[in-house]
């Protein structure tokens, strides 16, 4: 008799998930000498242990603590770039500006980027058919809890001036319900962080509006200021030119507003 399986609203575990995590771990530790001591098999075992045989709506941050411990990594605390709804450009930026780091430039963020995973209660199986959707099913699912955990730790580690890249094309440039708005903003430490600088990325070529005056940016400014962290904001009118100028800062066209 085929065993009844819970149907969730979200897509199932990414195919070849164990192999992907292990391969990413090996690749990352080869590229980053400071992480060469990491045992990737142990990392996978800890990752797996966080969700296998557990109800996928009952995952806690504690479940991920063994993985967090193995993935402990020191990034320069004053070189952190947060982002919200504009991941690709943020990653393009840190690929050029090698001394700055997004969460996905760390081992744990790199391992899980764009992947989905979940298990089933009381079985050692990975569920490749479906996984809980954050809205439709439950928020305490393996993927959401993972990102909440690593995002909190990443924000807590930040110091001095922290940058955040925001998508100016969205109706809510700053969204209180995003990971940035609900987790990272509230875990920046006022004792260590002096300023949060927002970069609002414009979408349209002819868009000359000052999006730093957007009501949602004002909301972010107020939230951050009340954490006793100063706030500043810059419009990035031409993201293509912005990246080009990061690559070639001597270019004469890079002195004007980007």
């Amino acid at each position: 008799v085929p065993r009844w399986r819970q149907q969730w609203s979200g897509p199932g575990t990414t195919k070849r998930f164990p192999e992907t995590v292990l391969a990413r771990c090996v690749k990352y530790t080869e590229i980053h000498p400071e992480m060469r001591h990491v045992d990737c098999q142990s990392v996978w075992d800890a990752f797996k242990g966080a969700f296998i045989s557990k109800h996928p709506c009952n995952i806690t941050e504690e479940d991920y603590q063994p993985l967090m411990k193995l993935g402990t990594q020191t990034v320069p605390c004053n070189k952190i770039l947060l982002w919200s709804r504009i991941k690709d450009l943020a990653h393009q930026f840190t690929q050029v500006q090698r001394d700055m780091f997004t969460l996905e430039d760390t081992l744990l963020g790199y391992l899980a980027d764009d992947l989905t995973w979940c298990g089933e209660f009381n079985t050692s199986k990975i569920n490749y058919q479906s996984c809980p959707d954050w809205r439709k099913d439950c928020s305490n699912n393996p993927v959401s809890v993972f990102w909440k955990t690593v995002s909190r730790r990443f924000a807590e580690a930040a110091c001095d001036v922290v940058h955040v890249m925001l998508n100016g094309s969205r109706s809510k440039i700053f969204d209180k319900n995003s990971t940035f708005g609900s987790v990272e903003v509230h875990n920046l430490q006022p004792e260590k962080v002096q300023t949060l600088e927002a970069w609002v990325i414009h979408g349209g070529r002819e868009d000359s509006r000052d999006l730093c005056q957007d009501p949602t940016i004002k909301e972010l400014e107020s939230i951050i200021s009340k954490r006793n962290i100063q706030f500043s904001c810059k419009n990035i009118y031409r993201p293509d030119k912005f990246l080009q100028c990061v690559k070639n800062p001597e270019d004469s066209s890079c002195t004007s507003e980007i």
Partner: antibody, heavy 115, light 111 residues
Framework: SVEESGGRLVTPGTPLTLTCTAS????????VTWVRQAPGKGLEWIGI?????TTYYATWAKGRFTISKSATTVDLRIASPTTEDTATYFC?????????????WGPGTLVTVSS | AAVLTQTPSPVSAAVGGTVTIKCQSS????????LSWYQQKPGQPPKLLIY???TLASGVPSRFSGSGSGTQFTLTISSVQSDDAATYYC???????????FGGGTEVVVK
């Protein structure tokens, strides 16, 4: 240091602008709060101006006061003073770091509203 | 609007003794810790003592300490000195800036 100026005797209804000036640093790069204290009374939080120029006011102060900034100063305008506005007015800067925390205060400027 | 109630006032203390001043807010301050304490002497502007509920401001003697979170906060002065005679104010910051307010003040008399 910071210093307030512009305090004087005015008649009720006469608009008055107080100015906060800094020496040794630029006020435009810091959060600035205005506070007042009536003779023999406690402190009252009036409002704050952010680095960006965004302003927020205490509920009781909305519509009665306006905070604005230039490159070097921060102003507090009292639109239509009444005798209840008689007080020493302080500006306080969140310098060198911070926002609503007030480590740097001016000596205050006295405003007297009387007919 | 938020109401910050300071107790007691006035409070009397002997040199070398300990003074405790309470500040109770009618609603929770931002992040449960955005409350600061100020000391004011006659004819002078206020002086920052404690911020974010428990962080000692630069140059402030360690006999001053702050504690509490949410709606209940305490300023403690241990080994009181005659120079500590002053009025002490708490300042609460709230989600709605319209609610931001100082407490009514607590006068400390040193005998």
């Amino acid at each position: 240091s910071v210093e307030e100026s512009g305090g004087r005797l005015v008649t009720p209804g006469t608009p008055l602008t107080l100015t906060c000036t800094a020496s040794g640093f630029s006020l435009s790069r810091y959060y600035v709060t205005w506070v007042r204290q009536a003779p023999g009374k406690g402190l009252e939080w009036i409002g704050i101006i952010y680095i960006s120029g965004t302003t927020y006011y205490a509920t009781w102060a909305k519509g009665r006061f306006t905070i604005s900034k230039s490159a070097t100063t921060v102003d507090l305008r009292i639109a239509s003073p009444t005798t209840e506005d008689t007080a020493t007015y302080f500006c306080a800067a969140a310098w060198p770091v911070g926002t609503y925390v007030l480590p740097l205060w001016g000596p205050g400027t006295l405003v007297t509203v009387s007919s | 609007a938020a109401v910050l109630t300071q107790t007691p006032s006035p409070v009397s203390a002997a040199v070398g003794g300990t003074v405790t001043i309470k500040c109770q807010s009618s609603q929770s301050v931002v992040n449960a810790n955005n409350l600061s304490w100020y000391q004011q002497k006659p004819g002078q502007p206020p002086k920052l003592l404690i911020y974010l509920a428990s962080t000692l401001a630069s140059g402030v003697p360690s006999r001053f300490s702050g504690s509490g979170s949410g709606t209940q906060f305490t300023l403690t002065i241990s080994s009181v000195q005659s120079d500590d005679a002053a009025t002490y104010y708490c300042l609460g910051v709230y989600d709605d800036d319209g609610d931001n307010a100082f407490g009514g003040g607590t006068e400390v008399v040193v005998k």
